[in-house]
């Protein structure tokens, strides 16, 4: 077929028609509709919303919309036996108890089924003991405590502030340090921006507000009972003792009013430096235990949550491609929320809904995309990316052969300052070109492009005149597509000014106060930032599904591979003597990167020149582009993390949210000076260099002329 046979209008006009159809007022209306009651995974309310979305996507004009269900392990508090933490005196009497629920926001006092704050998948238990304050509970915080301050957390209950890293990593670190319980709290230093009122008068966290969240360490496994395979009707489930990633000690989150009561009595060691002090009027003493007058008092946790196999529902919509129906571009975001989901996820789900409506409108006018577009409303993201992972496990053979790209669509906003994009290097040029065509919504940038405001506000640290684009980490539904299957992926949202706002995430994240009103009153009253995010996400999907040649530039991968090789080499060179002793060389990696660069350059030249009217050659070149991301997958996975298979990127072993480059080498080098067997440790570094060099070389060869 000719390149444009799929459409009844020119490609440029198609994109314009699609973008012009997106309306801020619709996104606002959809957000309101999605946020009036809680939609916790595994509940009837979230099932009803799945059916509503299925029905509306059908009305919008998609070819088919199906529910895909799975029975996965979820976690809920006990309704009659609430979780809380006490300070107990020497007689065991509870002299202070933490709150049982958050004070509901105005207008929501009579809403039922608001799940109280809890740490999902915490085991049951009632440990009691002395408290140790561990700052953010990062790897480096425990190094400071154990190595520098000689403080032993074994048998202690640790209290850690939220922020900086994924909460599951905090719990894992506490477990490894021997703690018998973990209390997580939100410090105003991280969740209260100066000069802003707390909700309902502003977007800051009130003292009674608490962040919910799962505390798993799944490393990409999906449902803890069925790693690698879908949790379907005939699934074989592991016993709970063999489940993947479950914490072994009780964990519970609290707000800063309650944290004040626990921390104000802390004794023992003073904080090691100012980076350990938050904004509460407490000494931030590390402990262990309470100070003089209160030294006989202890902390006791009361955790009664249960893990239950529960049915979840994804909504999968299909818009069949006219020319290449066997090539899939996927737009997915989750639907389940902790409570109302005003930002997470419904600001994203409302944008997806409007994107589906716009595509449906074009389809009703006779247009079809060149490639198939799949739309997904994922369930149980908050419980460990379960819905997306189970669906990808069920459809892995199709996806690895047909998956062109995955665009994630969780929260559209985490601020209203500028754009934030994390994606594969293959998409850099697509994002640059698209944002140059879109109008900036920012004040002071009227009539300017989104690219211009984004570049001004968030400049690239390496390349002047270009915006920052970050590595993909995890903590969201792109994980299985990118890290396990090697499908080119990207995400975009509006964010805060990271220079001036040092708090982690947005203050009301995963609290009861994440409401429609939070967005409508404080973040985006005109829904212009939501509209911009819809244009970016939708525009990316449109280009990926409709451009004749896939909008991937392999030369950008070459550039970052060199940067990442330089970075990991410089880390290794902090140990020059050992590198010499154990004959550690990065020559093979640098050689592979050089080969990749040369081959990518030649491929790009051929891409300019080939006969695009020849459908076989076009398909061949597009397949080389599509399969390039796949070529970075190692079927054996990373050490002890079999579902993280991408050799160039993986979630950091110390923070699931962050991406790490050459993660196999990085982890082999991490803290290598403390390893008991240096010969073995440096041997593993050499092995990881070998794996990385081989993978880069093998990927390069997929771009060579085929014969």
């Amino acid at each position: 077929k000719s390149s444009n046979e799929a459409t009844n209008i020119t490609p440029k006009h198609n994109m314009k028609a699609f973008l012009d159809e997106l309306k801020a007022e619709n996104i606002k209306k959809f957000l309101y509709n999605f946020t009036q009651i809680p939609h916790l995974a595994g509940t009837e309310q979230n099932f009803q919303l799945a059916k509503q979305i299925q029905s509306q996507w059908k009305e919008f004009g998609l070819d088919s919309v199906e529910l895909a269900h799975y029975d996965v392990l979820l976690s809920y508090p006990n309704k009659t036996h609430p979780n809380y933490i006490s300070i107990i005196n020497e007689d065991g009497n509870e002299i202070f108890n933490t709150s049982l629920f958050e004070p509901p926001p105005p207008g929501y006092e009579n809403v039922s089924d608001i799940v109280p704050p809890f740490s999902a998948f915490s085991p049951q238990g009632m440990p009691e003991g002395d408290l140790v304050y561990v700052n953010y509970a990062r790897t480096e915080d425990f190094f400071k405590l154990e190595r520098d301050m000689k403080i032993n957390c074994s048998g202690k209950i640790v209290i850690a502030r939220y922020g900086k890293v994924f909460r599951g990593n905090k719990v894992k670190n506490a477990q490894l340090a021997g703690a018998k319980g973990v209390i997580l709290y939100s410090d105003p230093a991280d969740y209260f921006a100066p000069g802003v009122k707390s909700y309902p008068d502003g977007w800051n966290l009130p003292g009674g507000g608490v962040q919910r969240g799962n505390i798993l360490n799944l490393n990409g496994a999906g449902d803890p009972l069925t790693p690698g395979y879908p949790a379907n009707e005939y699934a074989y489930r592991r016993g709970i003792a063999e489940a993947v990633g479950l914490p072994s000690i009780p964990v519970h989150p609290i707000g800063y009013y309650d944290a004040q009561k626990l921390l104000e009595k802390m004794g023992g060691s003073a904080p090691p430096d100012s980076s350990w002090r938050g904004s509460l009027k407490v000494p931030y003493n590390v402990g262990p235990g309470f100070t003089g007058n209160f030294s006989t008092q202890k902390v006791k946790m009361h955790i009664h949550s249960t893990n239950e196999v529960t049915r979840i529902y994804n909504v999968i919509g299909t818009l069949r491609g006219a020319v290449e129906p066997d090539r899939y571009v996927i737009l997915g975001g989750h639907r389940d929320s902790w409570v109302f989901g005003g930002i997470d996820p419904q600001s994203g789900a409302a944008v997806v809904h409007e994107i589906v409506r716009s595509f449906g409108t074009l389809k009703k006018e006779g247009w079809r995309p060149r490639r198939t577009i799949l739309f997904a409303s994922w369930d149980a993201e908050e419980f460990g990316l379960l819905g997306s992972t189970e669906w990808a496990e069920e459809n892995s053979r199709l996806l690895q052969e047909r998956g062109v790209a995955y665009i994630n669509a969780d929260s559209s906003i985490e601020g209203n300052y500028t754009l934030r994009v994390d994606c594969t290097p293959l998409m850099y040029s697509l994002v640059h070109n698209l944002t140059k065509e879109l109008k900036s919504p920012d004040e002071g940038f009227e009539g300017k492009s989104l690219y211009e405001s984004w570049t001004k506000k968030s400049p690239s640290p390496e390349f002047s005149g270009m915006p920052r684009i970050s590595k993909l980490g995890s903590g969201n539904d792109f994980e299985v597509f990118f890290q396990r299957l090697g499908i080119a992926s990207g995400r975009a949202r509006y964010t805060k000014n990271w220079e001036t706002n040092k708090f982690s995430g947005y203050p009301l994240y995963h609290s009861v106060y994440e409401t429609y009103e939070l967005v409508e009153k404080f973040y985006d009253p005109m829904f212009k930032y939501h509209l911009t995010v819809a244009q970016v996400r939708g525009g990316m999907v449109f280009e990926l599904a409709n451009s004749i040649v896939l909008p991937f530039d392999c030369r950008d991968y070459a550039v970052v591979l060199r940067k990442y090789a330089d970075k990991i080499y410089s880390i290794s060179m902090k140990h020059p003597q050992e590198m010499k002793t154990y004959s550690v060389s990065f020559d093979s990696l640098f050689s592979a990167v050089k080969n990749f660069t040369e081959i990518a350059s030649k491929f790009s030249e051929r891409l300019q020149d080939f006969d695009k009217s020849n459908p076989i050659v076009l398909r061949m070149m597009n397949d080389q582009l599509m399969f390039l991301e796949r070529a970075f997958i190692d079927p054996l996975g990373l050490p002890d993390r079999p579902f993280y298979r991408h050799v160039i990127y993986a979630p950091s072993s110390h923070n699931k949210y962050a991406g790490e480059s050459f993660p196999g080498i990085y982890d082999a080098l991490f803290d290598i000076e403390s390893k008991v067997d240096p010969s073995k440790a440096w041997g593993e570094v050499k092995r990881q260099i070998y794996v990385a060099a081989f993978t880069v070389q093998a990927a390069a060869e997929t771009l060579s002329e085929v014969a």
Epitope: Y84, F96, N97, L100, P104, D258
Partner: nanobody
Framework: EVQLLESGGGVVQPGRSLRLSCAAS????????MNWVRQAPGKGLDWVAF????????YYADSVKGRFTISRDNSKNTLYLQMNSLRPEDTAVYYC????????????????WGQGTMVTVSS
């Protein structure tokens, strides 16, 4: 209109019991800590008891500890004070008072008061 209305006061013999109620209207009781405060004839105000918004913590003045129990029913928007083993020195006008801070874990300043209910303990 935002208001608190106390009831249940009366004359009672020493050693007997009484239960005071305080009905809130015009605002949701569920978000606020609540207090009972009393004023004996010719004396100043004395704080009696406090309960957090969620009922997880209760604090009492030493003079009533072990005898009085503060409780609440958020679904009924009502605060209670169960007074057992009453003594003549418990004679006072009892006021309920709303804590000013949403979600406070300890008593703070009060911003809404009831009109009070008189309790007389006399033989």
């Amino acid at each position: 209109e935002v208001q608190l209305l106390e009831s249940g006061g009366g004359v009672v013999q020493p050693g007997r019991s009484l239960r005071l109620s305080c009905a809130a209207s015009g605002f949701p009781l569920i978000s606020y800590g609540m207090n009972w405060v009393r004023q004996a004839p010719g004396k100043g105000l004395d704080w009696v008891a406090f309960i957090t918004y969620d009922g997880s913590n209760r604090y009492y003045a030493d003079s009533v500890k072990g005898r009085f129990t503060i409780s609440r029913d958020n679904s009924k928007n009502t605060l209670y004070l169960q007074m057992n083993s009453l003594r003549p020195e418990d004679t006072a006008v009892y006021y309920c008072a709303k804590d000013r801070i949403v979600g406070a874990r300890v008593p703070d300043a009060y911003d809404i008061w009831g009109q009070g209910t008189m309790v007389t303990v006399s033989s």
